[in-house]
């Protein structure tokens, strides 16, 4: 057959469906490699085959749409399993093509079970609440376009293994899962299941995210650098290791970069000729405030660096601070004899 | 479409205990709790609790704890409830029945096996 | 345990005749709940669940609503393969649990 533009295996789009239940899933084409939507090349006399290949199988094999029941089917760019089976795992391909043109893209497919509890392999989005905020909501994910608005879907919620009923501060609405006041007891994994009829069958669609409860943007402060302060003074003699801690507190924020560096007389450590490491740690709050140290040793220190200006400082979304520590050079200790005897006049 | 076979009847000796099936076809059985149900002569139903066939987790009604044991045979697609300590107050009609996660109940019934306990 | 009371145990009515079963539920159920239609050979069918939807293949003369802590399943025009026996069931929490049946009889 004659040339085909391959996109290869999109690893991206890593496909995860739960067992026996419906699934739909659109070309990628469309959406990530051409320009042009399924509309559009319908319409220019393109076709768009699918085909895919078993796990553990090299041969690729053209999909079966005469199943009982229609199980897999295809309509426009997507195709859609009513329901899923485990053995539906595979590499799946959509191909494009007409007489003159041919676009193809794999993608990675895997069926996973899940357990009486909803745990499973399945890769869980992470949706954040803020601490103590008010109403806050999620809602049941990827369920667009599986059953047409005119049905009325039943929609169950659970946390973890158990059915939400009678909880205190959390309330399902419908496809919304409300909570009334957000704490860190609300950490966890919450799953709706959504029932819906389809010419006389019934099936159902499970979907689980994990909520983390996180600080509120209302108690959010400016970075908070803890160390170096006033009250420590980092007194060395030449030859010995200088190690200064920076320390610092940032408050969660929605995607805030958190940045901690080091300047030495206004500069950055890579910039002066001075053999300087620097060692980062990052610990996190329960609500996900951020705690980063950075140690800056010099592991011989000379009288030079001892006169230097050593500067922590910080910045995320709330602001920039920074703090210079206080280094000094020891004074060498008086030997007995010579000096304290000089200074009582002994000759 | 789905089915839920049972066998008809069960004649058991007080003291002893019996092993009842629910062969599953139909639907994916590892998908879907197994529910057992009770119905005395002439009385209501009463749940006594139910299976999940993937990882045999199980939840019990507190007053059939000690009197039943459900198990899973995925091979072959069968749900089991063992009855122990036969009395005449288990004799019964026992149903099994499927439901998806208790979101929307028992959706699927077998016919029901009819145990006598009678020496 | 979440007591199911369900009313009136017996009922009789004639053909074409508009009937409702009610359940009380002692808690809060959230709607968790199915109605259950049992034949006199013993079969179970299940008629409506999460309070108010009718099950596929069940006739449109079945209906489920609610109003506060009551449940109720109405018949809006009695057939004959009707007659039965009719229970309630929720499924808010374990154990679940079943009103105590309503034996509808044709008069």
């Known amino acids: 057959s004659e040339r085909c533009d391959d996109w290869g295996l999109d690893t991206m789009r890593q496909i995860q469906v739960f067992e026996d239940e419906p699934a739909r899933i659109k070309c990628p084409l469309f959406e990530h490699f051409l320009k042009f939507n399924y509309s559009t090349a319908h319409s220019a006399g393109l076709t768009l085959i699918w085909y895919w290949t078993r796990q553990d199988r090299d041969l690729e094999e053209p999909i079966n749409f005469r199943l009982p029941e229609n199980r897999i089917s295809k309509e426009k760019d997507v195709l859609w399993f009513r329901p899923t089976l485990l053995n539906d795992t595979g590499n799946y391909t959509c191909m494009l093509r007409n007489t003159t043109y041919c676009s193809k893209v794999a993608f990675p497919l895997e069926v996973v079970q899940k357990d009486s509890c909803f745990n499973s392999p399945m890769k869980l989005p992470v949706h954040k609440l803020y601490i103590e905020y008010g109403i806050q909501r999620i809602t049941c994910p990827n369920v667009d376009g599986y059953f047409p608005s005119s049905v009325k879907p039943t929609i169950t919620w659970y946390m973890g293994c158990y059915k939400i009923q009678n909880f205190n501060n959390v309330i399902p609405e419908g496809m919304n899962l409300s909570f009334l006041i957000a704490l860190i007891s609300n950490n966890g994994n919450y799953t709706c299941v959504v029932t819906y009829p389809e010419n006389g069958r019934t099936f159902h669609l499970t979907r689980t995210l994990t909520v983390k409860v996180v600080g509120s943007p209302k108690n959010a402060v400016p970075p908070v650098i803890h160390s170096p302060n006033d009250h420590v003074v980092y007194e060395k003699e030449p030859g010995e290791e200088l190690l200064i801690p920076c320390t610092v507190y940032f408050s969660f924020l929605m995607d805030s970069r958190n940045e901690v560096w080091w300047t030495i007389d206004g500069k950055k450590p890579d910039d002066i000729t001075i053999d300087v490491t620097i060692n980062e740690s990052i610990s996190h709050s329960r609500t996900e405030d951020e705690t980063r140290t950075q140690i800056l040793s010099i592991k011989k220190v000379t009288s030079e660096d001892l006169k230097r200006s050593y500067v922590c400082h910080a910045r995320s979304a709330k602001g920039e601070v920074a703090k210079a520590a206080k280094v000094k050079q020891k004074v060498p200790a008086p030997r007995y004899t010579v000096e304290l005897a000089c200074g009582f006049g002994a000759t | 479409q789905v089915q839920l076979q049972q066998p008809g009847a069960e004649l058991v000796r007080p003291g002893s205990s019996v092993k009842l099936s629910c062969k599953a076809s139909?639907?994916?059985?590892?998908?879907?709790?197994m529910d057992w149900v009770k119905q005395r002569p002439g009385q209501g139903l009463e749940w006594i609790g139910n299976?999940?066939?993937?990882?045999?987790?199980?939840h019990y009604n507190q007053k059939f704890k000690d009197k039943a044991t459900l198990t899973i045979d995925k091979s072959s697609s069968t749900a089991y409830m063992q009855l122990s300590s036969l009395t005449s107050e288990d004799s019964a009609v026992y149903y099994c029945?499927?439901?998806?996660?208790?979101?929307?109940?028992?959706?699927?019934w077998g016919q029901g096996t009819s145990v006598t306990v009678s020496s | 345990d979440i007591q199911m009371t369900q009313s009136p145990s017996s009922l009789s009515a004639s053909l074409g005749e508009r009937v409702s079963l009610t359940c009380r539920a002692s808690?809060?159920?959230?709607?968790?709940l199915s109605w259950l239609q049992q034949k006199p050979d013993g079969t179970i069918k299940r008629l409506i669940y999460?309070?108010?939807t009718l099950d596929s293949g069940v006739p449109k003369r079945f209906s489920g609503s609610r109003s506060g802590s009551d449940y109720s399943l109405t018949i809006s025009s009695l057939e004959s393969e009707d007659f039965a026996d009719y229970y309630c069931?929720?499924?808010?929490?374990?154990?679940?649990?079943f009103g105590g049946g309503t034996k509808l009889e044709i008069k």
């Open positions: 029945a499927r439901d998806y996660y208790g979101s929307i109940g028992m959706d699927s």
């Open positions: 139909g639907y994916t059985f590892t998908s879907y709790w």
């Open positions: 299976i999940y066939p993937s990882d045999s987790a199980t």
């Open positions: 808690q809060e159920i959230s709607d968790y």
């Open positions: 999460a309070a108010s």
């Open positions: 069931l929720q499924y808010a929490s374990f154990p679940w649990t």
